[in-house]
Structure formats: C-alpha cells, structure tokens
Amino acid sequence: WELTILHTNDVHSRLEQTSEDSSKCVNASRCMGGVARLFTKVQQIRRAEPNVLLLDAGDQYQGTIWFTVYKGAEVAHFMNALRYDAMALGNHEFDNGVEGLIEPLLKEAKFPILSANIKAKGPLASQISGLYLPYKVLPVGDEVVGIVGYTSKETPFLSNPGTNLVFEDEITALQPEVDKLKTLNVNKIIALGHSGFETDKLIAQKVRGVDVVVGGHSNTFLYTGNPPSKEVPAGKYPFIVTSDDGRKVPVVQAYAFGKYLGYLKIEFDERGNVISSHGNPILLNSSIPEDPSIKADINKWRIKLDNYSTQELGKTIVYLDGSSQSCRFRECNMGNLICDAMINNNLRHADEMFWNHVSMCILNGGGIRSPIDERNNGTITWENLAAVLPFGGTFDLVQLKGSTLKKAFEHSVHRYGQSTGEFLQVGGIHVVYDLSRKPGDRVVKLDVLCTKCRVPSYDPLKMDEIYKVILPNFLANGGDGFQMIKDELLRHDSGDQDINVVSTYISKMKVIYPAVEGRIK
C-alpha cells in the first residue's frame, strides 16, 4: 500500500509568492511559493495519486504583515482552502498567547491540530480541551494512518504560551501515544512535529512504532540529487535513521517559507512496515501557475494590508537616525531602538534567579536602511519601518560562547571606516574599541548585562560562559562576514518578523525618544 505525504513547515506567513530568498516578490516571473501556487501543485498530485496526505509541521504563524494584520485567521482560511489533513503546533503559534491560537486557528481549522507533548492545566485545561489533540487517526483510501504531533519543549523560551501549558520532553510524551495507536490496531504512524532536525532524528531512533517523521523548526533542506535552487542540502531526502529496534525510519523536512512542497512516497507492507521511501521537495517556482481562484482571494484579503501599512503605530519625538553615515560608524539611536525592541520582545520566563532569560542584542549597522524624521508630526507607520528594515528577516535567539562574541566584536571593526555593514549596534552590551590597535585586537572592554540578577548590571564578558543573544537571522546565518557566529553557535531558534518586533514595541511605548547613550565607545 502506497502513501504520498505532501508536507510544509515554517511557512511563516508567506501567503503571497516571494522572491527566491523568500522576501517580498519583486519580479513576478521569478517568484516562488505562495498558497495559490501550492494549491495548484497539491491539486495536481491529488488528481494523479490515490492516497495523499497534506501535512504541516508548524510555524505557519509570524513572518509578514499578513500575520500582523490577520493574526492567524489567514492561516485557518487558506489552510482550510487547501484542505490540509493535519498540522502540528509550532512554537510561533503561541506568539499572540494561547488566546491568539485558540480563537483564530484552533476553533476555525477544519483539520486536526496536534501536539502530544503539550499538556494544559488549571483553568485552561477545560477551555482548550479537544481543540488540539495528541494524535489523530485519519482514514486514507481503504487504510488508516495515525498522526502524532509534537512541539519544541523550548517554546516557553521562544514564544508566549503562558503558565498553563506544560511542554514535556518530546520522546517521553510521544511513546505512550504511539503505544495507544498500536492498541487501536493503527499500524502506520507518522510523527509530525516542530522541534528541529536533531530532535526529529532522535524521535525516529527512540520512539518505537513511529514509521515516518515529518519535521520543522530548523528550516532543514534535504535533497537527493542536484538541488534546484540556492539551498544547500543538509542530507539526502528522505534522511534515513536506523531506529534502536533496527527499522529504517525516513525523516523529512521541507526547508521553509512555502518555497518547496515536501513530496514523500512511502510503501507499506500489509503489517504496516515501511518497505521503501523516496521523494524530494518540489520547488514551487514560476513554472507552476498560481491557481486563479486562490489568487483572486489573496488579492481580496490583501486590501486590508495596504490600509494597515499607512496607519500610525506610535510617535517619535526625536529624529531616528538610521543613516548609514551614523549606524555603520558609531552608536546610532535607531540601532538602540531596534535592539531595545528586540530585548523587549523576548521578555519571558523570569524566575527568582533570572530577571529574564536573555539581555543582549547585536545588530549589523548595514541592516538599518533608513532614518525616520520626527518632523512628520512624529508619526511612525509600518511603511516607515519597512523602509528601515526592508529585508523581511527575523530576530532570532542564539546561544554563543563569550569567545565567539569577542570574535564578532573584533569583526565589527576589523576594517572600520569604510562604511561597511558589519559595524554592530548593541543592547545590553557596553563595548569599547581602540581603533589605533591592529585589526583583530581592537576590543579593549566588553561588558554584558547580567541575567541571573535581581538588579541588572554590566559585568565583564567571560570567554568560556554561554550567553543568549538576540540578533538578526542574517547574522545567525553568517552574513556580513560573521562566519564565527554561524560556525560556533550552540543553538539557534528562529524568532519573530523584524518589522513586527519593532512595530509592537512602538505601539506598546506609544511615544519613543531613543538616545545615544554610550553603549559603544
């Protein structure tokens, strides 16, 4: 019996087609992805093949103005239109709190939403009961397939799930649910979830009875043969893991941003064992036409976005200096504003020991593309912020050793004076450079704001200590020459859309007046 699994993950609000790098589509003839194009391909496969499941491994939420405005209603609507069969909860599904998940998505989805390792307690337990499930048995043709869901246990550090959801260890939580499916005579089981490729592989290895793992969170691109675009494969598709009980378990993921549709064919024997698996992600490029009905509906929904982008978010009573003449040479108040917003967006998980789990921000000055003049009545709009941060990136959470941070700050000024983009703006950091010294030895003082303290203060950076830092995904991926970050980071979790972070902060503060205050000397 053959099953076709179509899968997406980490779509992050890319409802419209995008450019090849998943930013705003400029030249339509070279654009990719989007739900209208995805629909065309999915329908084509459904017509051609008998047993097709369409699955999503989480993080539909967060990433463009679509999510900012529609807050998840757009996800439910278009996923319903595509007739998804199941979705696993990702960490970003909690970005607007539990209510922001329940109302727009859980109550509106016409497909099961899954996570076996999230347990509700207290007053939330009855409110959310039945709205998401640990597993679902889906009839497919003349057979049944069990889908069991999982979500990153780091979600409380990455999003806003509140205090009434407990995120258990994935493997510990999955095993009893898989065992339950076995007792229900379900012998074909897919683990669908959002914990990253390393955890996906562990699930394949450790959870007895899981036949296939469909993952997300790490934006992993797997491919067999010559890859069709810029993404470099992290391994073959499917990636085969040998389980502890000797089975070959295929593990798949489909990069991110709706650029590819994962396509996996699995052959099962009559006892539900995987006989063979093969496939590849399908690049959703312009050779696949956008479905006209979906496209027309996208255009209808778009109208509200255009209106939103010119509305006032808040006011500034000072000039927001985002000029390259400032931000690539010295501390600039636009850099301070953005870093403050980045830290503010990550205020969560305080306890008796820690006032917050992260206190530091770094931001390449070259990523700040425009100032905002306060003389326009002080008004700040989404449109203004889109000029400052035009690349559609995210502000991510990484863990780095102090020694890596020191290298990053040396790189920041290794060719100072040439108006290059690697000059770092900061938050929660005081750095002193001596530019008379030779490149690679110019950082003379680097103090960082403590997190394990009741009164935050600046302490010297310790080379062997592990620190959490918020930074643009561009830097986490080694952009602007920050190869040391990419090579040496110990953990990387994707965060929220850059403009959304700053706009939320400005809306919260109402009036802003960021200063140049001696963070960089």
Epitope: Q43, R46, R47, P50, N51, V52, L53, A73, H77, N80, A81, R83, D85, K107, E108, K110, L138, P139, V140, G141, D142, S293, I294, D297
Partner: antibody, heavy 119, light 108 residues
Framework: QVQLVQSGAEVKKPGASVKMSCKAS????????MHWVRQSPGKSLEWIGY????????TYNPKFEGRATLTVDTSASTAYMELSSLRSEDTAVYYC????????????WGQGTTVTVSS | DIQMTQSPSSLSASVGDRVTITCTAS???????LHWYQQKPGKAPKLLIY???NLASGVPSRFSGSGSGTDFTLTISSLQPEDFATYYC?????????FGAGTKLEIK
C-alpha cells in the same frame, strides 16, 4: 454541466442499514469535498458530514459519528453514504452536495434520495 | 455548536413588496462563511447568496445580503412570483456546520 445524480428512493425497516450513491459529472471529482445533508419531512436541513474524495478523509457531525459512513469510488466519480441502525426519525430526503473550497458554501446539490423507515 | 435562529419562521407578502429575513447566530460567525439558500417544494435547495453578500451565479439583483458578527439579513427588494419559497441561512465558520430552521415566504 456540473451535476450530481443520486440513487433512487429506499424503504427500510427499523434497525436496518441503507446505502445510497451520488454520481458526479462535469468537474474533477477529487477537487471538491462532498457533503451529505438530510431534510426530514417539513423540517430544516441537517448536516451529516463530508468526505475528501482525493483521499477518503472524512469529517462527521458528532450526532452521526459511528452511524454514518461516507466513502468514494474515485474511478467512478461516485460518493456513497451508508446509514446504519435506522429508526423512524431517519425518514428524510438525503442530499449529496458539493462544497466550494474557499468559503465552503454548497454550490451544487443532488436531486435527493428519499429514505422511508417504517416497520 | 453554533445555533442559527431565523426570523420570522413564516411570512406572507405580496408581489412587489420589500422583504427582509434575519438570521442570528448564537456566537460570532465570520461573514465569509455565512450563506443563504432558496428551496422550492419538492426540489433541492439552491445557493442564493454566499459569504453574506455575494450573489450566486444567475441570481437576480433584487436579492441582497448583509450583516456581520451574529446578525445577518437577506433582503428581496421587490418580490416576484417565483420568489415564494423557503429560505435557509447556513454557517460553516465552525464545525459542525449548521442551518437555520428556515423562513417560509408565502403569497398574501
């Protein structure tokens, strides 16, 4: 043109089962969900459930879960509904209905199958 | 479940009259997923208006729909003889899908 043609009227005894068919034509059968709705004499419309023809995935109204079974034969572009453990209150006209994929309205209706449950 | 309450349950009117039928949902329904059907005796229902206010193909412009949240209306601006029928509202904003009990429009 797009149409749904349903099987003929049935008379059944309480406790029995009935299986009715709905043949689709004029469109790609797998592209649209097929719903089943019933209407008791002089009453309103009541939704039973739907099936995704491309993979036979089903969603039921909890009221009919376990008693209604929806199936398809894609090669024949035909949907089926079986209702078991019939009782007199199941006497109704049963419609198969195609739904729009974007806004889930019912744009094409079958002519209906009359089921009479009587001892 | 979302209950859909239609009023009136029946209505007598004359050709040329303006008629309004209301549909009240027990909880908020997105206007995108609120639809109206017309049914004549012995026939299957027929789609009349979809997504609150959009006329289905071939439906005369004397029919219109409006509303949001929990309150929706179907209006016939000038009744014609062929409009005498039963009208149903329907939501599939949330599962299970539900219909109103119907409004029977009769000739006075």
């Amino acid at each position: 043109q797009v149409q749904l043609v349903q099987s003929g009227a049935e008379v059944k005894k309480p406790g029995a089962s009935v299986k009715m068919s709905c043949k689709a034509s004029g469109y790609t059968f797998t592209d649209y969900n097929m719903h089943w709705v019933r209407q008791s004499p002089g009453k309103s419309l009541e939704w039973i459930g739907y099936i995704k023809p491309h993979n036979a995935g089903t969603t039921y109204n909890p009221k009919f879960e376990g008693r209604a079974t929806l199936t398809v034969d894609t090669s024949a572009s035909t949907a089926y509904m079986e209702l078991s453990s019939l009782r007199s209150e199941d006497t109704a006209v049963y419609y198969c209905v195609r739904s729009d994929f974007l806004y889930w309205y019912f744009d094409v209706w079958g002519q209906g199958t009359t089921v009479t449950v009587s001892s | 479940d979302i209950q859909m309450t239609q009023s009136p349950s029946s209505l007598s009117a004359s050709v040329g009259d303006r008629v309004t039928i209301t549909c009240t949902a027990s909880s908020s329904v997105s206007s995108s997923y609120l639809h109206w059907y017309q049914q004549k005796p012995g026939k299957a229902p027929k789609l009349l208006i979809y997504s609150t206010s959009n006329l289905a193909s071939g439906v005369p412009s004397r029919f219109s729909g409006s509303g949001s949240g929990t309150d929706f209306t179907l209006t016939i601006s000038s009744l014609q003889p062929e409009d005498f029928a039963t009208y149903y509202c329907h939501q599939y904003h949330r599962s299970p899908l539900t219909f109103g009990a119907g409004t029977k429009l009769e000739i006075k």
